[in-house]
């Protein structure tokens, strides 16, 4: 057991052009605060991963508010160390997140508001025990400085905390097979001391609290022996009884991952997959739970009511993340329709509509004909938001009210002369020609392309079509 | 300006399913968590739960097991279904919406009363 | 769950007299998520307060709440007679949402 320390050193803009506009104004207040999250390994693993090693959040910060026209300077921090206590052993790698937050201070809708000003994330090998390291990040036009370090919780020593001390029982020398503490030279290794239980003649351990099985052996404290009668997955040598393979102890046997976690085996001992809200070799140890505010931007924290369940967040429209932490372009997801502008707000999101649709979401088509009378007998026609009038013969113009000139349009055809007439028009067709717009050509032997025309009619005559 | 209006059946029997439908009006659905609460005739406020349009749903544990909420976007509705009502599922059940800036009620139907009795 | 306890069960007070109605949390409310409602008689509840200190839109300013972590509370100045109704605190930090009993304001 142990801990994990981090010392914000500043945070303010880089080096370099583009410096950052300060994150608080006369207007918006702010404070800052940190957040550091630690993984096992050097995993690249997503921000929303969990933090199997732990997570930690300062304090807030003294609130800042920006001198008008001055750059961003180092902002104020907020007081003392992150620690991330840790029970088992320390990995020796880890990959570490640590976000800056700032909290605005302003009138904002339902209290303040957090957001997430930058991210910074690493690999590193670090022994407990070790001096602080130093270490310099940048995100965008921001750079964190800061130190950490890993110790070891007495009794508790060595580079992975996994050897345990204790007082010499006597001045000059330590037990049988037990050697002196370094750097504590007055103090004894300490033997082992395996999970609580554990079959003095079946098992052992390597870290405290472990039980791990000899051969032929099983069960969370090495008390049952392993069935001969299958041997269906053999691992360990042959039974000099039986004459077949006796599965050997497999580290997973009796699962020791608590909280639903999920056991693999390894080439040394086991790992754990726990599941969201645990953390810890054996996924024992729960890292944040509603009691600790985890939601941000006005989520609602559902279960983690207790250590031993795991949070989630439900997120206001408009943020999203496992923490709420990330604001949302609302209107990225289109949600007016028919061509609405959409508005964002913050508080709400309005849709402003084209002609011819309504609703909250332009979802409405109007009845762009409702109340909508065409004069003379014209019908009206919806159509894309907007009405028209289809006009009777004779009439046009958007309510047909207007008297059309019917021979505006120049409809008769191959240099036919058209006639205005109260039922419409008549066109006179050019020599050659016939038909209600003199579309037809007369063939030369005075037979036409149509059946023969009507009685009293000869070809080339005025052509009335009612 | 938004609107919201309760409706269903205002009598049930024992062990039947209380069903009510909301019909919001003045915004869409697809914006806001949507939520039922009820109150016995005389006495304080009790969430039943929510949902929002993408699924989400969250339920009072103490009606979890009987309770289901749904959403009709086509009809900017939301309804509540809880089962094997009784006696003591008598109340004044209103709909309403869920603020955008966190989980409280900014806008509630007028509220139904609905009595459990054969 | 988060209980929430309001006092005094009933305040009997004049018009024009200041109402202070208290809101108690078992366990601490997250960032003051804390909302306050008024019911009148056959009506739905109407916001009051969010964010224990935020006033709703239209609410007269002589609603005025304050307060953090379990303990909250509601100030009426100057009573008017439409004021007169029954007052709710909810929790909105941790799930599930909680109300409080409610403090009735009577005309005394």
């Known amino acids: 057991a142990g801990v994990f320390e981090l010392q914000i050193h500043s945070f303010g803009p880089g080096p370099g052009p583009g410096a950052p506009r300060s994150p608080c104004s006369a207007r918006l207040p702010c404070r800052l605060f940190f957040r550091v999250c630690l993984k096992p390994g050097l995993s690249e693993e997503a921000a929303e991963s969990p933090c199997a090693l732990g997570a930690a959040l300062s304090a807030r910060g003294p609130v800042y508010t920006e001198q008008p026209g001055a750059p961003a300077p180092d902002l104020p921090l907020p007081d003392g160390l992150l620690q991330v206590p840790f029970r088992d052993a320390w990995p020796g790698t880890f990959s570490f997140i640590i976000e800056t937050w700032r909290e605005e201070l302003g009138d904002q809708i339902g209290g303040p508001a957090w957001s997430l000003l930058a991210r910074v994330a690493g690999r590193r090998r670090l022994a407990a025990g070790g001096p602080w390291a130093r270490d310099i990040q940048r995100a965008g036009a921001w750079e964190l400085r800061f130190s950490y370090r890993a110790r070891c919780e007495p009794p508790a020593v060595g580079t992975a905390c996994t050897r345990l001390c204790r007082p010499r029982s006597a001045p000059s020398r330590c037990g049988p097979g037990l050697r002196p503490c370094a750097p504590l030279e007055d103090e004894c290794e300490a033997p082992l001391v395996c999970r609580a239980g554990c079959s003095p003649e079946h098992g052992f351990c390597e870290q405290p609290g472990e039980c791990r099985c000899l051969e032929g052996w099983t069960g969370p404290l090495c008390t049952v022996p392993v069935s001969t009668s299958s041997c269906l997955s053999p691992r360990g040598p042959s039974s000099a009884t039986t004459g077949c393979l006796v599965p050997g102890p497999g580290p997973c046997d009796g699962n020791p991952c608590a909280n639903g976690g999920s056991c693999s085996e390894t080439p040394r001992s086991f790992e754990c997959t726990c599941p969201r809200g645990f953390y810890g070799l054996r996924c024992e140890v729960s890292g944040v739970t509603c009691a600790d505010g985890p939601c941000f931007n006005g989520g609602l924290c559902v279960g983690g009511a207790d250590p031993d369940s795991a949070y989630i967040c439900h997120c206001p429209p408009g943020f999203q993340g496992s923490n709420c932490e990330k604001r949302v372009d609302r209107c990225s997801l289109q949600p007016c329709r028919n061509g609405g502008l959409c508005l964002d707000l913050g508080h709400a999101l309005r849709c402003r509509c084209r002609a011819g649709f309504a609703g909250p979401r332009c979802e409405h088509d109007l009845d762009d004909c409702a109340g909508r009378a065409c004069a003379n007998g014209g019908t009206c026609v919806e159509g894309g938001g907007a009405h028209r009038c289809s006009c009777a013969l004779g009439f046009g113009g958007r309510d047909c009210r207007e008297r059309a000139d019917p021979c505006a349009a120049r409809p008769c055809a191959h240099g036919g002369r058209c006639y205005a007439h109260f039922s419409g028009l008549v066109c006179a067709c050019a020599p050659g020609y016939m038909g209600a717009r003199c579309e037809f050509p007369v063939h030369p032997d005075g037979a036409s392309a149509l059946p023969a025309a009507p009685p009293g009619l000869r070809p080339g005559d005025p052509q009335r079509y009612l | 300006q938004v609107q919201l209006q309760e409706s269903g059946p205002g009598l049930v029997k024992p062990s039947e399913t209380l069903s009510l439908t909301c019909t919001v009006s003045?915004?869409?659905?697809?914006?806001?968590?949507w939520s039922w609460i009820r109150q016995p005739p005389g006495k304080g406020l009790e969430w039943i739960g929510y949902m929002y349009y993408s699924g989400i749903t969250n339920y009072n544990p103490s009606l979890k097991s009987r309770v289901n909420i749904s959403l009709d976007t086509s009809k900017n509705q939301f309804s509540l279904k809880l089962g094997s009502v009784t006696a003591a599922d008598t109340a004044v059940y209103y709909c309403?919406?869920?603020?955008?800036?966190?989980?409280?009620?900014?806008?509630w139907g007028q509220g139904t009363l609905v009595t459990v009795s054969s | 769950e988060i209980v929430l306890t309001q006092s005094p069960g009933t305040l009997s007070l004049s018009p024009g007299e200041r109402a202070t109605l208290s809101c108690r949390a078992s366990?601490?409310?997250?960032?003051?998520?804390l909302a306050w409602y008024q019911q009148k008689p056959g009506q739905a509840p109407r916001l009051l307060i969010y964010g224990a200190s935020s006033r709703a839109t239209d609410i007269p300013d002589r609603f005025s709440g304050s307060g953090s972590g379990t303990d909250f509370t509601l100030t009426i100045n100057r009573l008017e007679p439409e004021d007169f109704a029954v007052y709710y605190c909810?929790?909105?930090?941790?799930?599930?949402?909680?109300f409080g009993g409610g403090t009735k304001v009577e005309i005394k």
């Open positions: 366990q601490s409310v997250t960032r003051s998520y």
């Open positions: 909810q929790q909105y930090g941790t799930s599930p949402l909680t």
């Open positions: 003045g915004d869409s659905i697809s914006s806001y968590y």
């Open positions: 309403a919406r869920l603020s955008v800036a966190g989980f409280y009620f900014d806008y």
